[in-house]
Interface confidence: low
């Protein structure tokens, strides 16, 4: 993740917004899109949480009326929401490298209110060029949004976008192997608004994520779960209203 | 306040098996780890594993393998751990503690107040 | 496994005292430590985890330090409803693993 990367820089970006061929609706990747190889603030950021507070979860106690980090879920049949257009990601035509995922996508959720935490199956796990996209709605005075791609019990990826940390709005990513977080990785570059309509799109490369909220690019996370083909589950949790949850070969 | 009930004392034959319960309450169950703490004889914490309730994923200490089972029921947000092949040195407290992590956090941030497993013929 | 020492099992100290309890790892644990209240009535309660970091609703009195393989916890004013026993708790690695514990007593 570039520690000098700014959601201006995503935006301008070079004459060539899709230096890779990625659908225009991908979002204004910047030049050199690879070229980032996920800086990170080693030994930085050791958590610094209010005291007594954790960051990413509601502060045992704290928020009268909801309970835990997560203040329920939406019933089904409330909030509806735009539903998912399924076209909106053609495919290239390309068989995928394994063969798991024909081009043929999208898989996943069908469109319309689904419970949170929710938990999208990824059977064959994830490949290159393989696109995941939800769509949903960030609550009134959200606290967190979660995403994390499982193998097992672990963590191969977790997009953890922290409304309030310090008073501050950052997003975080980690790894947890054998129930043990890594070093995380920062981005202070924050697309999302309480209250608001998001697409978050999680496109998988061969050696990394790369994320992209709202058309734009925002940050790449390098692999550090290798065995792709494993990371069989995307839990989506925290406080939004979930209208879909798709993937797609491009 | 997030609350955690465990089901009262319990007195069994050697060799029976004895399964515990934790009620959670005041939080949403499947958004954190539940673990598993033996205090034998009111000394040393040992800690035995963890669940998460959302897909019942589980880890356990080794030492703990094939002696503690853990399941959840998420509709009644009940934590359990079944001891099998009970002998006297399972005699214990044992405790379920909410486990919360994020980042370089990982931490039992609240306890049931503990269940008595006595073990005698 | 990671061992995890607290060499002193019981501590007497009066009332107002500052109160250090200390804990030290096999190998270094980089910080990932906690601390943990046990009432002699057998109630549980975190203190402070990640070796500094006050837990919600824990008296400012109480503050953790330390690094690599040694860590402490430090009450800078004692009270009566600080006796108890005091655990020190690792999750560099699994499984995780508590100190011996540290019982304090009043004069």
């Known amino acids: 993740m570039a520690d000098n990367f700014s959601l201006h820089d995503a935006l301008s970006g070079s004459g060539n917004p899709n230096p890779q061929g990625w659908p225009g609706a991908w979002g204004n990747q910047p030049a050199g899109a690879g070229g980032y190889p996920g800086a990170s603030y080693p030994g930085a950021y050791p958590g610094q949480a209010p005291p007594g507070a954790y960051p990413g979860q509601a502060p045992p106690g704290a928020y009268p009326g909801a309970p835990g980090a997560y203040p329920g879920a939406p019933a089904p049949g409330v909030y509806p929401g735009p539903p998912s257009g399924p076209g909106a990601y053609p495919s290239s035509g390309q068989p995928s490298a394994t063969g798991a995922y024909p081009a043929t996508g999208p898989y996943g959720a069908p469109a319309g209110p689904l419970i949170v935490p929710y938990n999208l199956p990824l059977p064959g796990g994830v490949v290159p060029r393989m696109l995941i996209t939800i769509l949903g709605t960030v609550k009134p005075n959200a606290n967190r949004i979660a995403l994390d791609f499982q193998r097992g019990n672990d963590v191969a990826f977790h997009f953890n976008p922290r409304f309030n940390e310090n008073n501050r709005r950052v997003i975080v990513c980690n790894t947890k192997l054998d129930n043990n977080w890594g070093r995380e990785e920062r981005q202070s570059v924050f697309p999302f608004e309480s209250g608001k309509p998001f697409k978050i799109q999680v496109l998988v490369e061969p050696d990394h994520f790369k994320v992209a909220v709202n058309d734009a690019h925002l940050l790449q996370y390098n692999h550090r779960v290798k065995k792709l083909n494993e990371i069989s589950k995307l839990g989506i949790s925290g406080d939004i209203d979930l209208t879909s949850a798709s993937y797609t070969m491009i | 306040e997030v609350q955690l009930q465990q089901s009262g004392p319990e007195l069994v034959k050697p060799g029976s098996s004895v399964k515990i319960s934790c009620k959670a309450s005041?939080?949403?169950?499947?958004?954190?780890?539940m673990d598993w703490v033996k205090q034998s004889h009111g000394k040393r914490l040992e800690w035995i594993g963890y669940?998460?309730?959302?897909?019942?994923?589980?880890g356990y200490n080794q030492k703990f393998k094939g002696k503690a089972t853990l399941t959840v029921d998420k509709s009644s947000s009940t934590a359990y751990m079944e001891l099998r092949s009970l002998t006297s040195e399972d005699s214990a407290v044992y405790y379920c503690?909410?486990?919360?992590?994020?980042?370089?956090?990982?931490?039992?941030?609240?306890w049931g107040q503990g269940t008595s497993v006595t073990v005698s013929s | 496994d990671i061992q995890m020492t607290q060499t002193t099992s019981s501590l007497s100290a009066s009332l107002g005292d500052r109160v250090t309890i200390s804990c030290s790892a096999s190998q270094g644990i980089s910080n990932y430590l906690n601390w943990y209240q046990q009432k002699p009535d057998g109630t549980v309660k975190l203190l402070i985890y990640?070796?500094?970091s006050l837990h919600s609703g824990v008296p400012s009195r109480f503050s953790g330090s330390g690094s690599g393989t040694d860590y402490s916890l430090t009450i800078s004013n004692l009270e009566p409803e600080d006796i108890a026993t005091y655990y020190c708790q690792q999750y560099s690695k699994l499984p995780r693993t508590f100190g011996g514990g540290t019982k304090l007593e009043i004069n």
């Open positions: 503690a909410r486990s919360y992590y994020d980042g370089s956090y990982d931490a039992m941030d609240y």
């Open positions: 669940i998460y309730p959302n897909n019942g994923g589980t």
């Open positions: 005041r939080y949403t169950f499947t958004d954190y780890n």
């Open positions: 990640y070796t500094s």
